[in-house]
Amino acid sequence: TQHGIRLPLRSGLGGAPLGLRLPRETDEEPEEPGRRGSFVEMVDNLRGKSGQGYYVEMTVGSPPQTLNILVDTGSSNFAVGAAPHPFLHRYYQRQLSSTYRDLRKGVYVPYTQGKWEGELGTDLVSIPHGPNVTVRANIAAITESDKFFINGSNWEGILGLAYAEIARPDDSLEPFFDSLVKQTHVPNLFSLQLCGAGFPLNQSEVLASVGGSMIIGGIDHSLYTGSLWYTPIRREWYYEVIIVRVEINGQDLKMDCKEYNYDKSIVDSGTTNLRLPKKVFEAAVKSIKAASSTEKFPDGFWLGEQLVCWQAGTTPWNIFPVISLYLMGEVTNQSFRITILPQQYLRPVEDVATSQDDCYKFAISQSSTGTVMGAVIMEGFYVVFDRARKRIGFAVSACHVHDEFRTAAVEGPFVTLDMEDCGYNIPQTDESTLMT
């Protein structure tokens, strides 16, 4: 999990569409029990907003201690505040849990800016608005941290949902979701619907607002419209995918597709922004500026620093372009595209101007660690993390913010050749991926 524009955050070669339809969600295949349908008890179980993360309520220990936990697909540790901290309303008190077991091992997780460290143990964990199961899971009890917890975010820990390869201190520490699948009959799949507000929320509204849904063990059809399109998980560490083409308002950026995935492309609910490799970011911003050239914005806006404000209700969405990312499909030489609106990549910021104004930050930023499809991308889509079949599905979210003229889209198939060449092969080193 990279800090900076990461949560805790810290707050990025298509062709003509085919005439024939290629398979996407293969409806004719037998379904696993519980894989499809309705998961009423899990719908609306997330709260928060893109700038400070989405969290789910969890209980830890015996008797159960309730905590709000950030949902992070960009890391693999379950870590919770376990000592007093000025930004925490509550924390995990191991001494009060009769089922806590100490692993007698420490863990230290540094970020580009900030860090957390703690003590490893295991305890009983459940998700009240999740599957009706309790699992014994590894827990990092955070005893010290710097620039990790966010004042007013309302979460006290982090649920790393990625794979063991990037777990700390090493890949022998089983991540929570692996423990859940091993110890129960929950299918090896989860799905996320993150619902961006589209307008600023004040503190009381955030606490009262619904942020979306984490469906554990399945797919809820009520959370999306249209079809689910799947892209392969390239490697099971982060949720790594391959982008094969990028368009701004339908105009191809025309870069070598390796640049889009340099040095990787990941789907990460714990990052606020769409983060793009330097060259791609520069080309994208140039293209977005050109598309919106009837108005000019300050340099600091494009750096994600200055906020641009419009009189409430007058944000000129129409001058900003749509952004399309083409992802490798499941079928040879087939891709599909996901398209986001300015309503996703202009992030509303609360508590800065008067109620007469709507103010926004540009939520696309530069990365030195590859493309990160963060909350601003995910807020447009229902995203299925199908670990069992090593693939990630995208469909248009039923809660995405749009206007009467444009909507987010997931479309395909498109013919795209040599997509394997778009992946970047990272040289193997012992260096920490978290420190880049």
Epitope: F301, V308, C309, V352
Partner: antibody, heavy 120, light 108 residues
Framework: QLQLQESGPGLVKPSETLSLTCTVS??????????WGWIRQPPGKGLEWIGN???????YYNPSLKSRVTISVDTSKNQFSLKLSSVTAADTAVYYC????????????WGRGTLVTVSS | EIVLTQSPATLSLSPGERATLSCRAS??????LAWYQQKPGQAPRLLIY???NRATGIPARFSGSGSGTDFTLTISSLEPEDFAVYYC??????????FGGGTKVEIK
């Protein structure tokens, strides 16, 4: 070098419309590097931003004045203008036109200002 | 709304002395802050932008510092022509709309 000069009546009656023009000389108002703005200063008081305009005609106004303000641009004359309707004595001020440079963020060049008095 | 509070309202100093002017924002404006100088009967003049960068033609005795909510304009050794009113302005929110109330630097 580039200069800005405000012009317009120094006296306006209450409820009427204040109209000022800023003439840009020594450079083009159609430069893509700048916005152009109006700021006012009541006698003995501080500065108040009124609004900005880009040569394309894109405008931004102070929310507190928006219902009464219109800023327009005439690229052929290298001028931009301010109209403030339904004026009262509280609109008596020195009105400055200025260039918004340094990444469209700071007023780096100002006109000398013109005093407009609202009185019957 | 972001409010800029300047202090002191008036600063009485002699030529050659060091002047320290403060501007405090009601919430963080990062480093998007400017300082302007205004002499009687004249238009304001940009001195400092982005909190610490001197504008073109501004003497080295003027310097700006700070980020977030607390900013300082320092005049290392006052010249007679430096006696004026100084305003800060935030541009974290764009378009720039908020000026401080001003600090008058007068001859003691």
């Amino acid at each position: 070098q580039l200069q800005l000069q405000e012009s317009g009546p120094g006296l306006v009656k209450p409820s009427e419309t204040l109209s000022l023009t800023c003439t840009v000389s020594g450079g083009s108002i159609s430069s893509s590097s700048y916005y152009w703005g109006w700021i006012r200063q009541p006698p003995g008081k501080g500065l108040e931003w009124i609004g900005n305009i880009y040569y394309s005609g894109s405008t931004y106004y102070n929310p507190s004045l928006k219902s009464r303000v219109t800023i327009s641009v005439d690229t052929s004359k290298n001028q931009f203008s301010l109209k403030l309707s339904s004026v009262t004595a509280a609109d008596t001020a020195v009105y400055y036109c200025a260039r918004l440079g340094h990444g469209y963020s700071y007023f780096d060049l100002w006109g000398r200002g013109t005093l407009v008095t609202v009185s019957s | 709304e972001i409010v800029l509070t300047q202090s002191p309202a008036t600063l009485s100093l002699s030529p050659g002395e060091r002047a320290t002017l403060s501007c405090r924002a009601s919430q963080s404006v990062s480093s998007y802050l400017a300082w302007y100088q205004q002499k009687p009967g004249q238009a304001p003049r940009l001195l400092i932008y982005d909190a610490s960068n001197r504008a073109t033609g501004i003497p080295a005795r003027f310097s700006g510092s700070g980020s977030g909510t607390d900013f300082t304009l320092t005049i290392s050794s006052l010249e007679p022509e430096d006696f004026a009113v100084y305003y800060c302005q935030q541009v974290y929110l764009w378009p720039p709309r908020t000026f401080g109330g001003g600090t008058k630097v007068e001859i003691k």
